[in-house]
């Protein structure tokens, strides 16, 4: 029943070309190259992709042809290392080319940049985009893949193909519409927001695999799939977990052709065996491949079987607990996690993993004790505070969100997190706190039973963004500690951080608080970011400022922007009123 046991192929590149087809092959090679060489111009990548594609076709025609037996890493790495400007553009990354596989690929992976120095993508006018789409549809769509892939070097490649398909569909439909903009812009906004979310979710999967290992990822997958497929047998869930782990290991490792191929095989297996997996898969399985895989990944939880017996029988009351644990520790813990998760779609995956860890720690201690049963008899009581902590936190924060609204809730989090970790760069604090704040509108609308899985698992994704951005330029021991000690305890670790008393306040710089008339032409979102940037800087200057003080300054700031944007001579207003505002703020905060 192993989906991925394949006969050996003489030529791996020919095998993948035939499995995936030319269109997907070319798209995936482009994504792979753009994710590795994030600064290279589009035209250079297209040239490399075309060369690889032509070579693949020769191997399809004759698998014994020269170099066709080489691994994909060797072929792709050799191709990347032909880039003339490698040293000038990428510096020490060029040293990767002196290495042999597999070290060379590992070297390329280590140089992936989560925050590349690339210009923000500016959306052209609708007519301009439609003209470009009609003039050369293929180039237009390749450009989309390239621009997303280079900015999101861990984007889940087969899913990016799905986004590209939707992107194409949006232009095909809307460029013929009477009101092109009204048709297209909401679709592009939706794709952008979904794309960012998809990228962040995948980044967590890759971090889980790369920083905490396969066992951590498998535990996450057991918990999530058991919630999603509670009627499936443990062995079925285990099989899906093994296959899913292979898919994500490949994609996170840059093996995008294998990843896409294996993901398609996994979708096929799931649909062929849906009777043993979930009653919710029927609609997904009627869709074409890319839509099918996406649909399966997002499918709602199946109903829980009605007759599930008490967990205590197998995992607490049984005289054989230690015997079963000793015989196959990970299988026994996996079964505990499966049984707990399928009964608790109302828990976050990270909570389920904390419970499993607590159970494991208890067994390790108790199975070595004189009376094991007496020792572990109350293990389920230890779960209560672990369950209540996120429940209480979500309740409090949803109340705060409902009271403040999203923007002000984000501001509360900005202040909270800047006080916890003031060394972190202002753009990172703004980005992360804004995303943390989105948990309110995303999750607080849900009933109690869906709030925790929505909120805490989303927060894990956002905090991982903080962790990967901080890892590039580490500035805070507290962030490093929370990010590296335990994957499942990251959120409780950050929640537990108090104000950093060791922080020396930043010197006051009037330039930071000098604003110009250009703020008036910004979108509401961009204007919010400007104000939130100022708020972070204020807290960095005055970490002991009270909520009331900060609110007063921010209210004055909002009034100042509104006033000057209405003024006839905006620039003069910003210059003169700005000086007054800075002085008043300094006085209010005692700077």
């Amino acid at each position: 029943r192993g989906v991925f046991r394949r006969d050996a192929h003489k030529s791996e590149v020919a095998h993948r070309f035939k499995d995936l087809g030319e269109e997907n092959f070319k798209a995936l090679v482009l994504i792979a190259f753009a994710q590795y060489l994030q600064q290279c111009p589009f035209e250079d990548h297209v040239k490399l992709v075309n060369e690889v594609t032509e070579f693949a076709k020769t191997c399809v025609a004759d698998e014994s042809a020269e170099n066709c037996d080489k691994s994909l890493h060797t072929l792709f790495g050799d191709k990347l290392c032909t880039v003339a400007t490698l040293r000038e553009t990428y510096g020490e990354m060029a040293d990767c080319c002196a290495k042999q596989e597999p070290e060379r690929n590992e070297c390329f992976l280590q140089h992936k940049d989560d925050n590349p120095n690339l210009p923000r993508l500016v959306r052209p006018e609708v007519d301009v985009m439609c003209t470009a789409f009609h003039d050369n549809e293929e180039t237009f769509l390749k450009k989309y893949l390239y621009e997303i892939a280079r900015r999101h070097p861990y984007f889940y490649a087969p899913e990016l193909l799905f986004f590209a398909k939707r992107y194409k569909a949006a232009f095909t439909e809307c460029c013929q519409a009477a009101d092109k903009a009204a048709c297209l812009l909401p679709k592009l906004d939706e794709l952008r927001d979904e794309g960012k979310a998809s990228s962040a979710k995948q980044r967590l999967k890759c971090a889980s695999l790369q920083k905490f290992g396969e066992r951590a990822f498998k535990a996450w997958a057991v918990a999530r799939l058991s919630q999603r497929f509670p009627k499936a047998e443990f062995a079925e869930v285990s099989k899906l977990v093994t296959d899913l782990t292979k898919v994500h290991t490949e994609c996170c490792h840059g093996d995008l052709l294998e990843c896409a191929d294996d993901r398609a095989d996994l979708a096929k297996y799931i649909c062929e065996n849906q009777d043993s997996i979930s009653s919710k898969l029927k609609e997904c399985c009627e869709k074409p491949l890319l839509e099918k895989s996406h649909c399966i990944a997002e499918v709602e939880n199946d109903e829980m079987p009605a007759d599930l017996p008490s967990l205590a029988a197998d995992f607490v009351e049984s005289k054989d607990v230690c015997k079963n644990y000793a015989e196959a520790k990970d299988v026994f813990l996996g079964m505990f996690l499966y049984e707990y998760a399928r009964r608790h779609p109302d828990y976050s995956v990270v909570l389920l993993l904390r419970l499993a860890k607590t159970y494991e720690t208890t067994l390790e201690k108790c199975c070595a004790a004189a009376d094991p049963h007496e020792c572990y008899a109350k293990v389920f009581d230890e779960f209560k505070p672990l369950v209540e902590e996120p429940q209480n936190l979500i309740k409090q924060n949803c109340e705060l969100f409902e009271q403040l609204g999203e923007y002000k809730f984000q501001n509360a989090l900005l202040v909270r997190y800047t006080k916890k970790v003031p060394q972190v760069s202002t753009p990172t604090l703004v980005e992360v706190s804004r995303n943390l704040g989105k948990v309110g509108s995303k999750c607080c609308k849900h009933p109690e039973a869906k709030r925790m899985p929505c909120a805490e698992d989303y927060l894990s994704v956002v905090l991982n963004q903080l962790c990967v951005l901080h890892e590039k330029t580490p500035v805070s021991d507290r962030v490093t500690k929370c990010c590296t000690e335990s994957l499942v305890n990251r959120r409780p670790c950050f929640s537990a951080l108090e104000v950093d008393e060791t922080y020396v306040p930043k010197e006051f710089n009037a330039e930071t608080f000098t604003f110009h008339a250009d703020i008036c032409t910004l979108s509401e979102k961009e204007r919010q970011i400007k104000k939130q940037t100022a708020l972070v800087e204020l807290v960095k200057h005055k970490p002991k400022a009270t909520k009331e003080q900060l609110k007063a300054v921010m209210d004055d700031f909002a009034a100042f922007v509104e006033k000057c944007c209405k003024a006839d001579d905006k620039e003069t207003c910003f210059a003169e009123e700005g000086k007054k505002l800075v002085a008043a703020s300094q006085a209010a905060l005692g700077l």
Epitope: A235, E236, S276, P305, S318
Partner: nanobody, 124 residues
Framework: EVQLLESGGGLVQPGGSLRLSCAAS????????MVWVRQAPGKGLEWVSM????????YYADSVKGRFTISRDNSKNTLYLQMNSLRAEDTAVYYC?????????????????WGQGTLVTVSS
């Protein structure tokens, strides 16, 4: 390759006892719930008993409740069925099988590997 090999069947008088065994190989035995199923001469398949991976949860068809006991030894990769107070209507070929999906409330139940069976004959 998955293999299930039943043994222990035979001829027994009404009221007597038998212990069936099923030796499993080719898969991780402790991951799977296991079942005993039987087929009486000229009849369809009838589910007899099911056991959870660690043996703490057992289920029985009403027709055998109180007389049959299912058990397993994961260290030996073996499934057992202790049959007491045997009746003529228990005469059948008994198969052990690996559970693929299971709805305890009586819905869909599927088994993906079966043994070749062992014949139990209850007759005076």
């Amino acid at each position: 390759e998955v293999q299930l090999l039943e043994s222990g069947g035979g001829l027994v008088q009404p009221g007597g006892s038998l212990r069936l065994s099923c030796a499993a190989s080719g898969f991780t035995f402790s991951l799977y719930r296991m079942v005993w199923v039987r087929q009486a001469p000229g009849k369809g398949l009838e589910w007899v008993s099911m056991i959870s991976q660690f043996g703490n949860q057992t289920y029985y068809a009403d027709s055998v409740k109180g007389r049959f006991t299912i058990s397993r030894d994961n260290s030996k990769n073996t499934l057992y069925l202790q049959m007491n107070s045997l009746r003529a209507e228990d005469t059948a070929v008994y198969y052990c099988a690996k559970v693929r999906s299971w709805d305890q409330t009586g819905g869909r139940r599927t088994f993906d590997y079966w043994g070749q069976g062992t014949l139990v004959t209850v007759s005076s």
